[in-house]
Interface confidence: low
Amino acid sequence: GDLLIQKTIKKQVVLEEGTIAFKNWVKTGTEVYRQFWIFDVQNPQEVMMNSSNIQVKQRGPYTYRVRFLAKENVTQDAEDNTVSFLQPNGAIFEPSLSVGTEADNFTVLNLAVAAASHIYQNQFVQMILNSLINKSKSSMFQVRTLRELLWGYRDPFLSLVPYPVTTTVGLFYPYNNTADGVYKVFNGKDNISKVAIIDTYKGKRNLSYWESHCDMINGTDAASFPPFVEKSQVLQFFSSDICRSIYAVFESDVNLKGIPVYRFVLPSKAFASPVENPDNYCFCTEKIISKNCTSYGVLDISKCKEGRPVYISLPHFLYASPDVSEPIDGLNPNEEEHRTYLDIEPITGFTLQFAKRLQVNLLVKPSEKIQVLKNLKRNYIVPILWLNETGTIGDEKANMFRSQVTGKIN
């Protein structure tokens, strides 16, 4: 019995035309939603003038349907048993699942001012930037609609820069009509224990953002894992959102719509400083903001974002060091709401439910030459928003899964 089941599973999880896995892999049968909470700054003037703590109030959720598009350019390579594809991006606003509209206004850090002052730190160019910032009536903070903030707006300060530069700014700009990849993953035909594991991303086995092992593209994309998952396993996966590979560990058994699944979570150790977790030494790319690599819980992904000072963390700086959240008032981290988990059906390795949570932050630093930043007396890693991307297997799919997979085994 067991051998027959193993054989059937092995056959059905291969990523090739005609298998259950392939059909769901090309176009997910699960509805995936991305909820955003925006950190609305309550005291912009006090921060700019007195370097006060930033008081934020989260507003959300604002919900978008995502990952509804089928993979594109799906190409099998029989020689190395891989399949390559592009994952197209698309987001559709869901008013019924949101607290407001895409036209809602928020007071947030001025993305262009923060980024330009970080990229161009030379005093001379900062004097030029200062005159352009003043001329465009830009400030340290700005008021933007949700739509502008997420998907892009033409920045008045950048529009004055006298050389060709992208004047459109947005946390996820460009998004719609773009694609992530090319991914090339093992299809499992020759070795089922490698199925869905990424061979190359954008034609490379490394990212070129980090040093040493931190730069490796490990594991799958987290949508599925090789079958016969054990509780003792450390599940590696790559997330282009955070420009790195990361891992999850077993936390508990969960019953999902009658299907026994293993809940794997991203442990706090994955976000620890190299002092606590020496493996993380290569995620510390500079010594000043990180206080000689002793700060933890924030990841500087500026190398992956054309030098823009973007820092990724868990929502509300969950698992981050006190020095990171100290200048920000209004944050309330809690594990239940803010950690990331994957519910994996162990026989097939399919992720049947997940919640991917992350926070996007921008670094802003004092600058003697830029008037709107010159009263700052410290560096701030400013939270802009956090997101919760979730997906759960539908009832119909769950019934089918129960009858075809778990029912047969039990």
Partner: antibody, heavy 122, light 107 residues
Framework: QVQLQQPGSELRSPGSSVKLSCKDF?????????MTWVRQKPGHGFEWIGD????????IYGEKFEDKATLDADTVSNTAYLELNSLTSEDSAIYYC??????????????WGAGTAVTVSS | DIVLTQSQKFMSTSVGDRVSVTCKAS??????VAWYQQKPGQSPKALIY???YRYSGVPDRFTGSGSGTDFTLTISNVQSEDLAEYFC?????????FGGGTKLEIK
């Protein structure tokens, strides 16, 4: 590996001019990083000549070099240039280009060219 | 202009010793000081930035310290390959200026 490539030497006669090149092999960083030029004269230590930001062509010069040096850059070939005019024997020195590896323009430099030795002699 | 003075033009030391190279600024430069090593016939190599932060790949026997006007580069357990000239540089304000250099000789 070489990131900033400079010619080894240039010989010029007094009163003439010379244009020194510095090719950057990091095309991603070149436009956004300040390229700094310094010179080293035996017994005089290092002197800062000036900076150029290739993406906007913005320049700043040391007072001593305002009438002596002209900085420019070509973002197609990722090359920065330093032109020295009205050469005298006082301009004989090694001229270095330098920048920060990540393109952060703080004013310290961990990527240096090998230097071009300029000799002014009749 | 800010003048950086490296009072000792030459310093003599032995392999395994500890040596300190000093640099004094004519006015407060905060911690905006870098240190470079230059071997004969070579371009400078960056050792330290922001007064005390070591560049990756620089051996940990090189340590920078100081702020304001007084700065020190300390080499503990001197090795024969440390025979070189050491320069400080300030980038607190234009024009950037360099110290006159300290030549380290190995006895």
């Amino acid at each position: 590996q070489v990131q900033l490539q400079q010619p080894g030497s240039e010989l010029r006669s007094p009163g003439s001019s010379v244009k020194l090149s510095c090719k950057d092999f990091d095309s991603e960083v070149f436009p956004i990083a300040y390229m700094t030029w310094v010179r080293q004269k035996p017994g005089h230590g290092f002197e800062w000549i000036g900076d150029i930001l290739p993406s906007i062509g913005g320049t700043i010069y040391g007072e001593k070099f305002e009438d002596k040096a002209t900085l420019d850059a070509d973002t197609v070939s990722n090359t920065a240039y330093l032109e020295l005019n009205s050469l005298t024997s006082e301009d004989s020195a090694i001229y270095y280009c330098a920048r920060d590896y990540y393109g952060s323009s703080y004013g310290y430099f961990d990527v240096w060219g090998a230097g071009t030795a300029v000799t002014v002699s009749s | 202009d800010i003048v950086l003075t490296q009072s000792q033009k030459f310093m003599s030391t032995s392999v395994g010793d500890r040596v300190s190279v000093t640099c004094k600024a004519s006015q407060n430069v905060g911690t905006n000081v870098a240190w470079y090593q230059q071997k004969p016939g070579q371009s400078p190599k960056a050792l330290i930035y922001s007064a005390s932060y070591r560049y990756s790949g620089v051996p940990d026997r090189f340590t920078g310290s100081g702020s304001g006007t007084d700065f020190t580069l300390t080499i503990s357990n001197v090795q024969s390959e440390d025979l070189a000239e050491y320069f400080c540089q300030q980038y607190n304000s234009y024009p950037y200026t360099f110290g006159g250099g300290t030549k380290l000789e190995i006895k």
